[in-house]
């Protein structure tokens, strides 16, 4: 009987010879548990595991802690891969995080962090980032040092308010901080002066809600 090959991330999928964009089945580190993820095999050399995508407002991102933990949405469209998988994966080896952004005027930009990992659920999936480069602002729009993850039913931010309720979506809110890629999706011509939209402050300012976002990770030694 042929041994089942399992892949931890899209970099492993790519190196196995699968170089076409699409949905692949990945396996949790040190486990048989599986998860479906979208792999970008073309951008910047390929091998990118997509952990978040916004593009059309078809998926509700105002979700519970558990939903953000296990993931939701459709890997071929808008989705969140899942904090637990990403946490386990990024604690196995060093990963880079690339955040690709599109505005409503046809512009694109990115932020690349040379080291990214999420703490465990016990530490509220706190985000850790180092080494920012890219075109989406010289200052990190994810507050540094990193914050705990917060959702509508898991308030771990620093604000007296509940950032997830004010701004909608789960995110690494500060009080509430310069970004939220999981905010409300606003269509064109309704996307300005929105405090609760899809925000990346150091690229587009405070009230601008973006058209599309993708968060992707890849091993640093790819």
């Amino acid at each position: 009987k042929e041994e089942q090959i399992s892949f931890r991330d899209c970099a492993e999928v790519f190196k196995s010879g699968h170089t076409t964009n699409g949905i692949y089945t990945l396996t949790f580190p040190n486990s048989t548990e599986e998860i479906k993820a979208y792999c970008d095999m073309e951008a910047g050399g390929g091998g990118w595991t997509i952990i978040q995508r916004r593009e059309d407002g078809s998926v509700d991102f105002q979700r519970t802690w558990k939903e953000y933990k296990v993931g939701f949405g459709n890997p071929s469209g808008e989705y969140w891969l899942g904090n637990e998988f990403v946490s386990q994966l990024t604690n196995q080896q060093r990963y880079v995080l690339k955040i690709h952004l599109k505005d409503w005027e046809g512009n694109e930009a990115y932020s690349l962090y040379e080291h990214f990992y999420l703490s465990s659920e016990e530490l509220n999936y706190r985000i850790h980032l180092k080494g920012l480069t890219g075109t989406a602002g010289k200052i990190s729009s994810i507050s540094q040092p990193g914050n705990d993850f917060s959702t509508k039913d898991g308030d771990n931010d620093k604000c007296i308010c509940k950032c997830s309720q004010m701004l909608t979506g789960g995110w690494w809110f500060d009080a509430c901080g310069p970004s939220n890629l999981n905010g409300m999706y606003y269509p064109q011509r309704q996307n300005t002066n929105k405090f609760n939209g899809i925000k990346w402050y150091y690229w587009k300012g405070s009230g601008y809600s973006l058209k599309a976002t993708t968060m992707m990770i890849r091993p640093a030694d790819f």
Partner: antibody, heavy 120, light 108 residues
């Protein structure tokens, strides 16, 4: 009509205590947050304390922590500020204010204020 | 604690003048948590602007707010006699809540 009415101010000796009340009408305090803000004679506004009556969370300025206690009785629609170990620097007009915790995320209604004088 | 540094601390202006007051926060603030208040002598403060730029109900349109991040501004486009007062910015996001030190607008 929304109204906040403070009472309980007066002259007190250093080390003494006072309890201020903030009676609300025209709205239910459990749907809002309540703040106490003070203003020393000729000075600016200083936030003192906040309570979220529905959740029971309380927050204090460092200058009053351990001496002042904010509370609320939702059945009486009233908030309180218990002030112990009073000092001369606590002399001020004390205002209670309603804080809307969605939009406007701000203190939209204020009481008329009650004067607290701490002096021997 | 977040410091809210207002400037100027006082200014003299004439009726009809355009007046600008600035407030600088010591760290990044989400815009929805910044408000401006007006206070006249012996009276309680009144809310003018919330969310950094939204005009509160009943406030004349000559008042406007702008800014984001750490720098916020209150503008009175054409000063009226009833606008002579003290103005305060405030952040409501982090405990302790903090006010600016106030800007007194006086008649020239």
């Amino acid at each position: 009509e929304v109204q906040l009415v403070e009472s309980g101010g007066g002259l007190v000796q250093p080390g003494g205590s006072l309890r201020l009340s903030c009676a609300a009408s025209g709205f239910t305090i459990s749907d809002y947050w309540i703040d106490w803000v003070r203003q020393a004679p000729g000075k600016g506004l200083e936030w003192v304390a906040k309570i979220t009556p529905a959740g029971g969370y309380t927050y204090y300025a460092d200058s009053v922590k351990g001496r002042f206690t904010i509370s609320a009785d939702t059945s009486k629609n009233t908030a309180y500020l218990q002030m112990n170990s009073l000092r001369a620097e606590d002399t001020a007009v004390y205002y209670c204010a309603r804080f809307v915790f969605f939009l406007p995320y701000a203190m939209d209604y204020w009481g008329q204020g009650t004067l607290v004088t701490v002096s021997s | 604690d977040i410091q809210m540094t207002q400037s100027p601390s006082s200014l003299s202006a004439s009726v009809g003048d355009r007046v600008t007051i600035t407030c600088r926060a010591s760290q990044f603030l989400s815009s929805f948590g910044v408000a401006w208040y007006q206070q006249k002598p012996g009276k309680a403060p009144k809310l003018l602007i919330y969310g950094a730029s939204s005009l509160y109900s009943g406030v004349p349109s000559r008042f406007s707010g702008s800014g984001s991040g750490t720098d916020f501004t209150l503008t009175i486009s054409s000063l009226q006699p009833e606008d002579f007062a003290t103005y305060y910015c405030q952040q409501g996001l982090l405990s302790p809540l903090t006010f600016g030190q106030g800007t007194k607008v006086e008649i020239k």
